[in-house]
């Protein structure tokens, strides 16, 4: 069971990143699915290595004082979402903006029907060029 | 099937990074090989988690305006290469240069004879000290 | 065999990071253990994918000129420790400090009784907020 999906620009105002099965994507079988373009949902309980990579372009003067934060979140059936992993990068002083890449990854127990998704502080700063931003998992 | 190889400084003018089976490297068996010191080639079709880490040292004034970009690329038999993953980091203002590290990783389907390699915008900026820059894969 | 442990602030003056089985941690079975809150120790020989993520907050003026470096280290029975992976990030000019995240990961052969741990140049700069700093491994 494995998946690798590719970032997609979105006009939605949500902080949850959108993904697509496009380009050189992976969706090994129907035991993992991409739901609503935003979350990877697994049918089997078990340990999964889950990862995300987010490239963004921001400028210190044009951004809030808070850093750019990417969070990997878990939503189990009947529960509130919880944060599994976070990474933070202070905005660049480069103009118009400076690109930076964040990588998150870890091993977590998922229940049947659990979903994972990626949340960022400012989705408008995310880079969607080929290979820059992606999200995936693999069952151990 | 798994491999982990170590960066090697090169006098070549190519943007493709060079690797070696040295130090604490891994080459599990002959189903994965390091070819020409530049690419990991697999003999078996399947899903692989492929990763690379690149540490570099650059300065904004001494570099081009474009960021430092590391790309994980795939070359399948009889096809052009394609970019699987990219990460970008704006150059530092530190002098003489500021070190930064990039990590790339994802799950991809590889065909028999497929090769993966790492390309960077400026190989002269790459740090080759122990543990700083490496490249590997594992078959799921 | 898999583990994922969560960073813990420590009053110790050591540069080795401290970890705990808390929050959304993983410890699949007793073939991997967290020893002394600082190292993951495995009982079985084999290939492991080992990873660490470290988020830190530093300022160029308040820090030494040397970059912030995170190292993934191996201690095998009867041997000196050795560095497997390192990542370096130059300190930010943001005030009071600028957050940055480092991710390390690679495939390594471990012997029975081998331990892995994470070392940083300045543990006081490490961020211990939910999800920011973690450490884990999985057996292939």
């Amino acid at each position: 069971i494995a998946a690798h999906v590719i970032s997609e620009a979105s006009s939605k105002t949500t902080s949850v990143l959108q993904w697509a099965e496009k380009g050189y994507y992976t969706m090994s079988n129907n035991l993992v699915t991409l739901e609503n373009g935003k979350q990877l949902t697994v049918k089997r309980q078990g340990l999964y290595y889950i990862y995300a990579q987010v490239t963004f372009c921001s400028n210190r003067e044009a951004s809030s004082q808070a850093p750019f934060i990417a969070s990997l979140c878990l939503k189990s059936p009947g529960r509130f979402e919880r944060i599994l992993l976070r990474a933070a990068n202070t905005h660049s002083s480069a103009k118009p903006c400076g690109q930076q890449s964040i990588h998150l990854g870890g091993v977590f127990e998922l229940q049947p029907g659990a979903s994972v998704f990626v949340n960022v502080t400012d989705p408008s700063q995310v880079s969607h060029g080929t290979g820059f931003t992606s999200f995936g998992l693999l069952k151990l | 099937i798994a491999a982990h190889v170590i960066s090697e400084a090169s006098s070549k003018t190519t943007s493709v990074l060079q690797w070696a089976e040295k130090g604490y490297y891994t080459m599990s068996n002959n189903l994965v090989t390091l070819e020409n010191g530049k690419q990991l080639t697999v003999k078996r079709q399947g899903l692989y988690y492929i990763y690379a880490q690149v540490t570099f040292c650059s300065n904004r004034e001494a570099s081009s305006q474009a960021p430092f970009i590391a790309s994980l690329c795939l070359k399948s038999p009889g096809r052009f290469e394609r970019i699987l993953l990219r990460a970008a980091n704006t150059h530092s203002s530190a002098k003489p240069c500021g070190q930064q590290s990039i990590h790339l990783g994802g799950v991809f389907e590889l065909q028999p004879g497929a090769s993966v390699f790492v390309n960077v915008t400026d190989p002269s900026q790459v740090s080759h000290g122990t543990g700083f820059t490496s490249f590997g894969l594992l078959k799921l | 065999i898999a583990a994922h442990v969560i960073s813990e602030a420590s009053s110790k003056t050591t540069s080795v990071l401290q970890w705990a089985e808390k929050g959304y941690y993983t410890m699949s079975n007793n073939l991997v253990t967290l020893e002394n809150g600082k190292q993951l120790t495995v009982k079985r020989q084999g290939l492991y994918y080992i990873y660490a993520q470290v988020t830190f907050c530093s300022n160029r003026e308040a820090s030494s000129q040397a970059p912030f470096i995170a190292s993934l280290c191996l201690k095998s029975p009867g041997r000196f420790e050795r560095i497997l992976l390192r990542a370096a990030n130059t300190h930010s000019s943001a005030k009071p400090c600028g957050q940055q995240s480092i991710h390390l990961g690679g495939v390594f052969e471990l012997q029975p009784g081998a331990s892995v741990f994470v070392n940083v140049t300045d543990p006081s700069q490490v961020s211990h907020g939910t999800g920011f700093t973690s450490f884990g491994l999985l057996k292939l």
């Epitope: 902080s15 949850v16 969070s71 979140c73 939503k75 529960r79 509130f80 979402e81 919880r82 944060i83 998704f117 949340n119 | - | 929050g23 959304y24 907020g129 939910t130």
Partner: nanobody, 122 residues
Framework: EVQLLESGGGLVQPGGSLRLSCAAS????????MAWVRQAPGKGLEWVSG????????YYADSVKGRFTISRDNSKNTLYLQMNSLRAEDTAVYYC???????????????WGQGTLVTVSS
């Protein structure tokens, strides 16, 4: 010090609308689920609605489903409750509450605001 400050309550006619706000400080707002709980005059506490840390998951009591909408703005450290089609039985003091920790399977609260009074009457 954790502080939760509710506002937006008042007198409204049946069928009307109100928007409650809860300004949070003293903790990392975006890490915690939050909830609205109410207490009608002479009654016990009633859970109204809850929202996950990043706003992706919402739950509602059957009595308010389809009429109330919970939301949050993590950049402003603020929790909201949009109340439409208000009824007399919605009259209560509304409290915002913070999840005790972001690991609990069942929502347990450790901090509450002082509350804001909503009166629905003609």
């Amino acid at each position: 010090e954790v502080q939760l400050l509710e506002s937006g309550g008042g007198l409204v006619q049946p069928g009307g609308s109100l928007r409650l706000s809860c300004a949070a400080s003293g903790f990392t707002f975006e890490l915690y689920a939050m909830a609205w709980v109410r207490q009608a005059p002479g009654k016990g506490l009633e859970w109204v609605s809850g929202i996950g840390a990043v706003g992706e998951t919402t739950y509602y009591a059957d009595s308010v489903k389809g009429r109330f909408t919970i939301s949050r703005d993590n950049s402003k450290n603020t929790l909201y409750l949009q109340m439409n089609s208000l009824r007399a039985e919605d009259t209560a003091v509304y409290y915002c509450a913070k999840e005790a920790n972001n690991l609990s399977d069942n929502l347990v609260f450790d901090y509450w605001g002082q509350g804001t009074l909503v009166t629905v009457s003609s």
